[in-house]
């Protein structure tokens, strides 16, 4: 069993290395920024990311492209729930520095949890998406 788990871990590692999770990150950032825009946040605030949603994109245009590609990538993990969880964790880690404040972080986490379901995939049962140490946030 230990041998099988080791092989599973290796397979997951190589799957993660070949996955392009950027479209998922973009899709989620678009979602939470669109929500914020409707609450009066300045949609023209600058961003470090060359592919971060433009004010035009944030209104929904181009969003389906990120979602479609994101779902294709997550679909590759459908047979391995633990690996799917690791992919979600990686998305959370990659974006944590770009999330401004606790509220945005919680919102991103909430959208991230819903992502597999949004793609018509099974969501991992237990998946810890907490980035900083301290209280663990259970799936």
């Amino acid at each position: 069993r230990q041998q099988w788990e080791l092989q599973g871990d290796r397979r997951c590692q190589s799957q993660l290395e070949r996955a392009n999770l950027r479209p998922c990150e973009q899709h989620l950032m678009q979602k939470i920024q669109r929500d914020e825009d409707s609450y009066g946040r300045d949609p023209y605030s600058p961003s470090q990311d060359p592919y971060s949603p433009s004010p035009y994109d944030r209104r929904g245009a181009g969003s389906s492209q990120h979602q479609e590609r994101c779902c294709n990538e997550l679909n590759e993990f459908e047979n391995n729930q633990r690996c799917m969880c690791e992919a979600l964790q990686q998305i959370m880690e990659n974006q944590s520095d770009r999330l401004q404040g606790r509220q945005q972080e919680q919102q991103f986490k909430r959208e991230l949890r819903n992502l597999p379901q949004q793609c018509g995939l099974r969501a991992p049962q237990r998946c810890d998406l907490e980035v900083e140490s301290g209280g663990r946030d259970r799936y």
Epitope: N20, P23, Q26, Q65, R69
Partner: antibody, heavy 123, light 108 residues
């Protein structure tokens, strides 16, 4: 050397079938999404079909949907396109292309192409 | 389906001149999913630009891509004899992954 070599093209009558193959070498085939793109004589490029690394997501152009089937065999480093109910309009050079992405920023692109195999549908 | 319309259909210029090729989408395309390819007669297409503005490995810096939303541009700052070819834009964000009809760049 990274290489894609298509084969299986030829002359076929309308309504007939043909199976194209693409042999990959010089890279880890199972790490990449793959595509078929075609070009009719004197015309532009037309995307035909794509398949993800583990064959879990497959797409087709409307013009071939229900007639063409894309598949891959990662153990044999090969990509296939089964073409049924062929029409005159399917006459083209068929290219096999590897899809990669920029690891740091995410954009996808087809960076390696075969030289193509010619399919002629004519009575 | 996202339709990409390239203009002009044919562009006649001399070596040393600047070429501006346009690609217009029927609906917004995220920069992440806009690609440019070059094709010479009897050859397979060659990747030029991806992500709307990033040059592929080995592509000279006289080639540049720009634009966003529905309007994208490929610019060749100073044409070299080997640049005369057909250029295609493609979107690969939404299936079907459509190509533009191409712009033929010919020697004047």
């Amino acid at each position: 050397e990274v290489q894609l070599v298509e084969s299986g093209g030829g002359l076929v009558k309308p309504g007939g079938s043909l199976r194209l193959s693409c042999a990959a070498s010089g890279f880890i085939f199972s790490d990449y999404n793959m595509n078929w793109v075609r070009q009719a004589p004197g015309k532009g490029l037309e995307w035909v079909s794509s398949i993800t690394r583990s064959s879990r997501t497959i797409y087709y152009a409307d013009s071939v949907k229900g007639r063409f089937t894309i598949s891959r065999d990662n153990a044999k480093n090969s990509l296939h396109l089964q073409m049924n109910s062929l029409r005159d309009a399917d006459t083209a050079v068929y290219y096999c292309a590897r899809e990669d992405f920029d690891v740091s920023t995410g954009p996808y692109y087809m960076d390696v192409w075969g030289n193509g195999t010619t399919v002629i549908v004519s009575s | 389906e996202i339709v990409l319309t390239q203009s002009p259909g044919t562009l006649s210029l001399s070596p040393g001149e600047r070429a501006t090729l346009s690609c217009r989408a029927s609906q917004s395309v995220s920069n992440m999913f806009l690609v440019w390819y070059q094709q010479k007669p009897g050859q397979a297409p060659r990747l030029l630009i991806y992500g709307a503005s990033t040059r592929a490995t080995g592509i000279p810096d006289r080639f540049s891509g720009s634009g966003s939303g529905t309007d994208f541009t490929l610019t060749i700052s100073r044409l070299e004899p080997e640049d005369f070819a057909v250029y295609y834009c493609q979107q690969n964000g939404n299936s079907p992954y459509t190509f533009g009809q191409g712009t033929k760049l010919e020697i004047k």
